[in-house]
């Protein structure tokens, strides 16, 4: 989290952001909030982002003026306008590109003064794994896909039985690029599975974290996965 | 690659008038801000006015508020300066500029307006 | 109206001499917007620095900015025969536009 205050000259603002990450080819949201003001005409956001000459965006007098947007920004960036007026300057970012990465400040001009904030955006590929059990194979084999990873992340196995257990001497990881030749698919196998344990395929870069959980018992397999986001910090 | 082209610049006797124009080229120029700036011989850079992309905001400097008029045709690529009431001190280099984050990041090569009688 | 004071107003400097240029403002200057052209005898104006430290495309590594509130200044690292030029700082933070009254830089 990062909160910021205003300059001097008026009174200054507070304004927070929040670090985050973009996953390549999706929207994504810039996080930014301020103290509201009760008239939306006296409110100006400026999005601005290090190295770039052009405002990310930039909305005034209640709506979004553009004139002086950067190129690369061009028909992809909106603010929530109808939360402006209780203090919500996020930014939503659409198609996030590799190139979106890098360091915004969230700049906001009220009747009660001003205020800015700087958040780090980070953009990468991170996607769910699904762990299925490899019938093909010819032990117990699992096998562990997710679709679109970048950068290229670190695969870990574990086992709730076996805990600390190291599986790499039994497993195999590849990575195939993906047709936009940026994102890459993770497959990730496991040898000599045994039964009624509960096995997790760990895949981590340092955007993201996922994990698939599957638990092979002889009447049933259970499966679960779920995805964090590093370094989500508040400014 | 971004091109910037004034022209009607000449001669022109105090009180009277002329109207310049600006040819831009190699980006959008409807999804962009603009600027005239001028230059007196010899003297410094001064800022004369701003149109938006869809002429809805339009800022004049206080030396030429009521006397020029800043505008526009996105369908022709044009910027245009109607300067009316002329005077010695306008005599200057004429540029226009393309403002990019409250920055002028392309110039065009200037036309000279000359007052004089 | 934001008022941009440049000093020195001229300088002459050795190749090689590293040169500082300096603009103040009579007021703050919001969101950075601070920017620095550089016009060579005969040319048009170039954007050369823009939000107080950022190089436009093309100008080299030579060139920095730095500056926050109302004090800005441009280094020239070690000079060179073609910076021979006159440098403008301009704020784009309020209406109206202003520019510093610029410094000629000469070559010694």
């Known amino acids: 989290l990062i909160i910021g205050f205003g300059i001097s000259g008026r009174h200054s603002i507070t304004v927070t952001t929040v670090a985050s990450a973009g996953n390549i080819g999706e929207d994504g949201i810039l996080s930014c909030t301020f103290e509201p003001d009760i008239k939306l005409s006296d409110i100006v956001i400026q999005w601005l982002k290090e190295g770039v000459l052009g405002l990310v965006h930039e909305f005034k007098e209640g709506k979004d003026e553009l004139s002086e947007q950067d190129e690369m920004f061009r028909g992809r960036t909106a603010v929530f306008a109808d939360q402006v007026i209780v203090g919500n300057a996020s930014l939503r970012l659409k198609n996030v590109q590799l190139t979106d990465a890098g360091t915004y400040k969230c700049y906001i001009i009220t009747s009660k003064g001003k205020g800015n904030a700087n958040l780090e955006y980070k953009t990468g590929a991170f996607s769910m794994p699904e762990v299925n059990v490899d019938y093909n194979a010819s032990s117990e084999t699992l096998r562990c896909e997710a679709p679109r990873w970048f950068p290229q992340p670190t695969v870990v196995w574990a086992s709730q039985v076996d805990q600390g257990a190291n599986f790499s001497e039994v497993s195999n990881t590849s990575f195939e690029l993906n047709s936009e030749n940026v994102t890459m698919k993770v497959v990730s196998v496991l040898y000599n599975v045994t039964i009624n344990n509960t096995y997790s395929c760990m895949i981590e870069n340092d955007i993201a974290k996922a994990t698939g959980d599957i638990k092979v018992t002889e009447s049933e397999i259970k499966r679960r996965s779920h995805l964090q986001l590093l370094n989500s910090k508040a400014s | 690659e971004v091109q910037l082209v004034e022209s009607g610049g000449g001669l022109v006797k105090p009180g009277g008038s002329l109207k310049l124009s600006c040819a831009a080229s190699g980006f959008t120029f409807s999804d962009s801000g603009m600027h005239w700036v001028r230059q007196a011989p010899e003297k410094g850079l001064e800022w004369i006015t701003y149109?938006?992309?869809?002429?809805?905001?339009?800022y004049y400097a206080d030396s030429v508020k009521g006397r020029f008029t800043i505008s526009r045709d996105n369908a022709k690529n044009t910027l245009f300066l109607q300067m009316t009431s002329l005077r010695s001190e306008d005599t200057a280099m004429y540029y226009c500029?393309?403002?990019?984050?409250?920055?002028?990041?392309?110039w065009g090569q200037g036309t000279s307006v000359t007052v004089s009688s | 109206e934001i008022v941009l004071t440049q000093s020195p107003t001229t300088m002459a400097a050795s190749p090689g001499e590293k040169i500082t240029i300096f603009c103040s403002a009579s007021s703050s200057i919001s969101s950075d917007f601070l920017h620095w052209y550089q016009q060579k005898p005969g040319f048009s104006p170039k954007l050369l620095i823009y939000?107080?430290?950022n190089l436009a495309s093309g100008v080299p590594a030579r060139f920095s900015g730095s500056g926050s509130g109302t004090s800005y200044s441009l280094t020239i690292g070690t000079m060179e025969a073609e910076d021979v030029a006159t440098y403008y700082c301009?704020?784009?933070?309020?209406?109206?536009?202003?520019f510093g009254g610029g410094t000629k830089l000469e070559i010694k």
């Open positions: 939000r107080i430290s």
């Open positions: 149109i938006n992309s869809g002429s809805s905001t339009i």
């Open positions: 301009q704020q784009g933070s309020n209406v109206p536009r202003t």
């Open positions: 500029a393309r403002g990019r984050g409250y920055a002028m990041d392309y």
